[in-house]
């Protein structure tokens, strides 16, 4: 799996999970979130060469097509596969609100 | 939706469905498929600017992050959303075989 266990241990130019810490206030302008101040969002990036973690039959076909037609611009792309939620705390006036935001943290990647 | 109805009608630099015809023999080296000779596989390509068809909460966050931090390299990517199968006919000796290959045709795209 193209997850932290693999990608953060290996120097990998191909599609892999990349570390990205997002500070809510500085990076997104969301000053009102009380906790956490930021989180490890991560992101996916890297090349998708022939059969590198291909997701669907189409991405496998596209990968093969690119190998045979290297001048082609149609190639698979490195995107998130597994995502996890993030729980935040903020205040509505003096009232605390805890909310779980779905699909906020990327845990693994794929070529799609 | 970033599908043929929208994308093939508009000249669009942003993430959109692009036409791609694949000839099994010439483009993939698959000489054994009897019918069809090829098919409209299509593919997804184009930029994923702020809020252009963002797929998940993470891709929306990444989109916002990129807008505020334009020097960042962490941006969403244009990939397939809806896929359809393709039915092929081939022969095992003289015995015809009809098979449905899943996820072979891209029908729409998204930024993920």
């Amino acid at each position: 799996a193209l997850d932290a266990a693999y990608c953060f241990r290996n120097v990998q130019d191909n599609c892999c999970l990349r570390p990205l810490y997002i500070d809510f206030k500085r990076d997104l302008g969301w000053k009102w979130i009380h906790e956490p101040k930021g989180y490890n969002a991560n992101f996916c990036a890297g090349a998708c060469p022939y059969l590198w973690s291909s997701d669907t039959q189409h991405s496998r076909v596209l990968s093969l097509y690119n190998t045979i037609n290297p001048e082609a611009s149609a190639s698979p792309c490195c995107v998130s596969q597994d995502l996890e939620p993030l729980t935040i705390l903020y205040y509505i006036g003096k009232t605390p609100k805890i909310e779980q935001l779905s699909n906020m943290i990327v845990k693994s990647c794929k070529c799609s | 939706a970033l599908d043929a109805a929208y994308c093939f009608r508009n000249v669009q630099d942003n993430c959109c469905l692009r036409p791609l015809y694949i000839d099994f023999k010439r483009d993939l080296g698959w000489k054994w498929i009897h019918e069809p000779k090829g098919y409209n596989a299509n593919f997804c390509a184009g930029a994923c600017p702020y809020l252009w068809s963002s797929d998940t909460q993470h891709s929306r966050v990444l989109s916002l992050y990129n807008t505020i931090n334009p020097e960042a390299s962490a941006s969403p990517c244009c990939v397939s959303q809806d896929l359809e199968p393709l039915t092929i006919l081939y022969y095992i000796g003289k015995t015809p075989k009809i098979e449905q290959l899943s996820n072979m045709i891209v029908k729409s795209c998204k930024c993920s």
């Epitope: 302008g29 205040y91 009232t95 | -």
Partner: antibody, heavy 121, light 107 residues
């Protein structure tokens, strides 16, 4: 230039619903809370509720008895306010107003031009 | 809910004079070193516009003839050297507690 442009005036029958839109431009829609405020003829301002467009989190004023629904479309940077079970007391000008940005519940620094909703049988 | 009471309900002021509007909250709107009180002006036929943020901070683009003061429950908006263009309804607003609430206005 920050702009909030609301949909036009509406005339509705008692018991019906109305949906008012607020199309924004000139700022990053996902960065700010969007509030809705109403003003009955010759009266003051009543806060109805707010939405955070990035993921659709909402807070409502209980005064509106669950009749109000706030939504947002990030792809078009547009906020919506739907008010159901309309009655004569709902005749008012409805405003969308952007939150200042420091707190979830905050002052409002930019306002739409207002949408007059009339309820008449 | 916090109730905001403005006085006077209406006010007539001659040009170049100073006008004062009071706003009293039913409970303190101070938290974390801030007073969560704001002032707006709604000119005839227009939408409200923010004048003062957090009790005393002049909003960008607003004339420095407007000033705000106060803390806890008692707040004041002052308009010096009043002009005809200042005509309208002035509202105070608190956001210290949910629901956010406005005063009834001073004309």
């Amino acid at each position: 230039e920050v702009q909030l442009v609301q949909s036009g005036a509406e005339v509705k029958k008692p018991g019906a619903s109305v949906k008012v839109s607020c199309k924004t431009s000139g700022y990053i829609f996902m960065k700010y809370w969007m509030n809705w405020v109403r003003q009955a003829p010759g009266a003051g301002l009543d806060w109805m509720g707010q939405i955070f467009p990035a993921w659709g989190s909402t807070n409502y004023n209980e005064m509106f008895e669950g009749r109000v629904t706030l939504t947002a479309d990030t792809s078009t940077s547009t906020a919506y306010m739907e008010l159901s079970s309309l009655r004569a007391g709902d005749i008012a000008v409805y405003y969308c107003a952007r939150g200042y940005g420091n707190y979830a519940l905050d002052a409002m620094d930019y306002w739409g031009q207002g949408t007059l909703v009339t309820v008449s049988s | 809910d916090i109730v905001m009471t403005q006085t006077p309900p209406s006010l007539s002021v001659s040009p170049r004079e100073t006008a004062s509007i009071s706003c009293r909250a039913s409970e303190s709107v101070d938290s974390y070193g801030n007073s969560f009180m704001h002032w707006y002006l709604q000119k005839p036929g227009q939408s409200p516009q923010l004048l003062i943020y957090l009790a005393s901070n002049l909003e960008s683009g607003v004339s420095d003839r407007f000033s705000g003061s106060g803390s806890g429950t008692d707040f004041t908006l002052r308009i010096s050297r009043v002009e005809a263009n200042d005509t309208g309804v002035y509202y105070c607003q608190q956001n210290d507690e949910d629901p956010l609430s406005f005063g009834q206005g001073t004309k």
